[in-house]
């Protein structure tokens, strides 16, 4: 999906009002210095591309974050403020339902959410290019 035509300011508002708080809640009890950020993003479409991938793609040691509150709110924000996003996600959602597992907060998931926090912070940088 090409995130170029999203309403970035509306997504930023959704992040600041709720998503950021849900990420902090998920990370509660973890020191902010515990994980090194190894990925970043260039402009807002890039940030959303990486946020989407990191939030919804299973990775080694962290099978799924998709059912977490921050992920559901991220998905809703993208569906509302990115034209055509919902249609591209129908097949992906069906595949995700098939492989859904019991929620377990592993250290790898904490590390992944720490990376997500960094990507969202970069997305919100005032000087970051729209596209």
């Amino acid at each position: 999906y090409d995130f170029t035509n999203c309403d970035f300011e509306k997504i930023k508002a959704a992040y600041l009002s709720t998503i950021s708080k849900d990420l902090i809640t998920y990370m509660s009890g973890t020191k902010s210095t515990e994980f090194n950020n190894t990925v970043s993003c260039s402009n807002r479409p890039h940030c959303l591309t990486e946020i989407q991938s990191l939030t919804f793609n299973p990775t080694a040691g962290c099978a799924s974050l998709a059912k977490e509150m921050f992920a559901m709110k991220t998905k809703a924000a993208l569906a509302i403020w990115c034209p055509g996003y919902s249609e591209t996600q129908i097949n992906a959602t069906q595949a995700m339902k098939k492989r859904r597992k019991r929620k377990v907060t592993t250290n790898k998931c904490l590390e992944q959410v720490s990376q997500l926090q960094g990507l969202w912070r970069r997305f919100n940088r005032p000087l970051l290019k729209q596209q």
């Epitope: 990925v39 970043s40 993003c41 260039s42 402009n43 479409p45 991938s53 080694a60 992944q112």
Partner: antibody
Framework: QVQLQESGPGLVKPSETLSLTCAVS?????????WSWIRQPPGKGLEWIGY???????SYNPSLKSRVTISRDTSKNQFSLKLSSVTAADTAVYYC??????????WGQGTLVTVSS | EIVLTQSPATLSLSPGERATLSCRAS??????LAWYQQKPGQAPRLLIY???SRATGIPARFSGSGSGTDFTLTISSLEPEDFAVYYC??????????FGQGTKVEIK
């Protein structure tokens, strides 16, 4: 520390597909960062080809996108480049590098690929 | 596509002298700029990122400055091992990251 090593044929015929592999040691490619390919034609500057991130997102240079595929094999801790329909203009030293998806902090030593019949 | 223009193409200096290399972007890249050093037959090495932050292990004689469209890499006092080609790279314009054409710093 992380080390990267490119391998693959040094000579490819025009119209064929160039295939290179980058073996990574000292760091798991599924643990963090992105893993990138960059090339440098003889005596010229650098050109970014694309990357695959540790969580599988892929990004390509738009000028090469139609011909490029980057993939990974986490069990072997390596990632690969395929460039199709090559011409003499694709003759270059090809580097693999570790990236934070912005800049490139560790590089392989590079491998020269010549496109010639 | 953002074009990076480096100047001069070649800089002839003696060890101990100060080197000032320029990189100009065709449009603003904020501080999203890196500098690399490349010696003959070797891969590039990251020197500076975010326009002014030194990469791990890079000596303090290397410094970067600038923002927007005009950037400078300064080597305060050239050591023999500093004679090489230097490239700038912008990462403001994903997915079109681009490099400058390079500046060669040679021994006078």
């Amino acid at each position: 520390q992380v080390q990267l090593q490119e391998s693959g044929p040094g000579l490819v015929k025009p119209s064929e597909t160039l295939s290179l592999t980058c073996a990574v040691s000292g760091y798991s490619i599924s643990s963090g960062y992105g893993w990138s390919w960059i090339r440098q034609p003889p005596g010229k500057g650098l050109e970014w080809i694309g990357y695959i991130s540790y969580y599988g997102s892929i990004s390509y240079n738009p000028s090469l996108k139609s011909r490029v595929t980057i993939s990974r094999d986490t069990s072997k801790n390596q990632f690969s480049l395929k460039l199709s329909s090559v011409t003499a203009a694709d003759t270059a030293v090809y580097y693999c590098a570790r990236t934070n998806l912005l800049y490139f902090d560790s590089w392989g030593q590079g491998t020269l690929v010549t496109v010639s019949s | 596509e953002i074009v990076l223009t480096q100047s001069p193409a070649t800089l002839s200096l003696s060890p101990g002298e100060r080197a000032t290399l320029s990189c100009r972007a065709s449009q603003s890249v904020s501080n999203n700029l890196a500098w690399y050093q490349q010696k003959p037959g070797q891969a590039p090495r990251l020197l500076i990122y975010d326009a002014s932050s030194r990469a791990t292990g890079i000596p303090a004689r290397f410094s970067g400055s600038g923002s927007g469209t005009d950037f400078t890499l300064t080597i305060s006092s050239l050591e023999p091992e500093d004679f090489a080609v230097y490239y700038c790279q912008q990462y403001s314009d994903w997915p079109q990251y681009t490099f400058g054409q390079g500046t060669k710093v040679e021994i006078k």
